[in-house]
């Protein structure tokens, strides 16, 4: 905290303007108004203040606001937002999807970086968190904005909280988002993407909702092998094992088209390895890849998970 | 990649008035400030002052701000300083620079520099 | 304005031994500290920050250290292409002031 010191004469500042760049932290302290400064907070991220002023900064807007910001003075806090901590952010009430977009540029990095930080800072979560909290549920508008600056922004949360996007915002998100989403999260996420899309043509429908797959099950598989859709490699590695390991031989034939043939590189990793072991030999043979590991011609398989529903 | 480029070298007589360029490339020019220092023979660094090309806004280091003017021209991603009532203390080689962060005045990228010579 | 003074002015160094110069300020400036590596003909490139954060791509060999008042820059082994003059910057407050330099040779 910086100690009340005297502001010198001819010092006082009667408007936020450069010439404050060149104040000393308890120059900052005694000479700049809080008033002042909420009101001309536009100003401040138009001047070059270092790290070290903003502390002064923020110190006096905490005494004038201790129960937390308006949303006028945060919607203009620019480089200011980047001393908040989660426990000052926990204290607003952000509405505005401009406001929400403006601390998200601010905090974008300022670095020249192609590459968008994978999951949110702290204070970026407790932000985008309070924010949606207060609209209720993720509509298109906040997830276009969230994925744009965050691409692994929906991986980051949990299926609880994935249940509140409705099947709208779906037509948002891109592949890119869905990257580090686990299998839970795409349990959630497919049936909303499988009732967005659902009037879409067959090779359109494939396109949009190819990387929400992991969630799909096995009959939905079954369904796109009769569509000859072309799946590559990549996405049906991706998918559930459990989803996978019904299929006959020819239905993943089917799904996968001329791609069949990456199978053989795969043979050893899930699914493809787990749903081998499940398929017979001689069927697996048809498929001229000497995938191998099936199960041998003359044996009889039981399923003893059904033999047990039904017990 | 971001690139300064400035001008060429200078050969001027004292009392005379010049004008620097610093072309940038590869970001976005008007999204951070455009800093100026500079380095006299043997000698270490100097701030000069800054533009935000976005805004024109700019500040200078107190005993630069009579002489010295620091400008942009958007439509050709470039900034200017214009140097006056040049003395034999102004050879220097000037540099263009710019911050990325600017809570965190670091010179993150530099120009070649331009060396400007006073002398009658 | 804050006054940032370097120490030696020169220093030479053996071939993989240890370098050290030092950075002092006239004012506690906290962390806001870079160092910067300037070669002959050549504009200074960022090394440190935060006295203590390396540049990405900078090898590891160059480590900083310090807070408040007083700051290190430790080269751990010395390389040929390591011969250059250094320079500590303070950004704690404006005008950014920069000290004299150090300039690193071999032994």
């Known amino acids: 905290e910086v100690e009340k010191t005297a502001c010198p004469s001819g010092k006082k500042a009667r408007e936020i303007d450069e010439s404050l760049i060149f104040y000393k932290k308890w120059e900052l302290e005694a000479c700049v108004d809080a008033a002042l400064l909420a009101t001309q907070m536009d100003r401040v991220n138009a001047i070059p203040f270092t790290y070290e002023q903003l502390d002064v900064l923020k110190h006096k807007l905490d005494e004038l606001y201790p129960q937390g910001y308006p949303e006028s003075v945060i919607q203009h806090l620019g480089y200011l937002f980047l001393k908040m901590s989660p426990e000052d952010i926990r204290k607003w009430n952000v509405t505005s999807l401009e406001t929400l977009k403006a601390l998200l540029e601010v905090n974008k990095g300022h670095e020249m970086s192609p590459q968008a930080p994978r999951r949110p800072l702290p204070q970026v979560a407790t932000l985008i968190d309070r924010f949606v909290k207060g609209r209720g549920q993720l509509d298109k508008d906040t997830l276009d904005t969230l994925t744009a600056f965050y691409p692994g922004y929906l991986c980051s949360l949990s299926p609880e909280e994935l249940s509140s996007v409705p099947p709208s915002s779906i037509w948002a998100v891109r592949p890119q988002d869905l990257d580090t989403c686990d299998p839970r999260q795409l349990d959630v996420l497919y049936p909303k993407a499988r009732l967005a899309f659902q009037n879409m043509n067959g090779s359109e429908y494939f396109v949009k909702i190819q990387s929400f797959l992991g969630g799909a099950p096995t009959e939905d598989l079954k369904a796109l092998s009769q569509q000859n859709v072309s799946m590559d490699l990549a996405t049906f590695m991706k998918l559930r094992t459990d989803a996978v390991l019904p299929l006959t031989v020819a239905e993943v034939q089917k799904l996968l088209g001329p791609h069949v043939e990456g199978l053989k590189a795969e043979e050893r990793h899930r699914p493809v390895r787990d749903w081998i072991l499940r398929q017979r030999q001689d069927d697996l043979d048809t498929l001229g890849l000497g995938l191998q590991g099936g199960i041998p011609n003359g044996y009889l398989v039981l399923d003893l998970s059904m033999q047990e529903a039904l017990s | 990649q971001v690139q300064l480029q400035q001008s060429g070298a200078e050969l001027v007589k004292p009392g005379a008035s010049l004008k620097l360029s610093c072309k940038a490339s590869?970001?976005?020019?008007?999204?951070?400030?455009m800093h100026w220092v500079r380095q006299a023979p043997g000698q270490g660094l100097e701030w000069i002052g800054a533009?935000?090309?976005?805004?024109?806004?700019?500040i200078y280091y107190q005993k630069f701000k009579s002489r010295f003017t620091i400008t942009v021209d958007k439509s050709t991603s470039t900034a200017y300083m214009q140097l006056s009532s040049l003395t034999s203390e102004d050879t220097a080689v000037y540099y263009c620079?710019?911050?990325?962060?600017?809570?965190?005045?670091?010179?993150?990228?530099w120009g070649q520099g331009t060396t400007v010579t006073v002398s009658s | 304005d804050i006054v940032m003074t370097q120490s030696p002015d020169s220093l030479a160094v053996s071939l993989g031994e240890r370098a050290t110069i030092t950075c002092k300020s006239s004012?506690?400036?906290?962390?806001?500290l870079a160092w910067y590596q300037q070669k002959p003909g050549q504009p200074p490139k960022l090394l440190i920050y935060?006295?203590?954060t390396r540049e990405s791509g900078v090898p590891d060999r160059f480590s900083g250290s310090g807070s408040g008042t007083d700051f290190t820059l430790t080269i751990s082994s010395l390389q040929a292409e390591d011969v250059a003059v250094y320079y500590c910057?303070?950004?704690?407050?404006?005008?950014?002031?920069f000290g004299q330099g150090t300039k690193l040779e071999i032994k």
């Open positions: 004012h506690d400036v906290g962390t806001s």
């Open positions: 533009i935000h090309p976005n805004s024109d806004n700019t």
């Open positions: 590869g970001y976005t020019f008007t999204s951070y400030w």
């Open positions: 935060w006295a203590s």
């Open positions: 620079a710019i911050i990325i962060t600017p809570v965190v005045p670091k010179f993150d990228y």
């Open positions: 910057q303070q950004y704690s407050s404006y005008p950014l002031t």
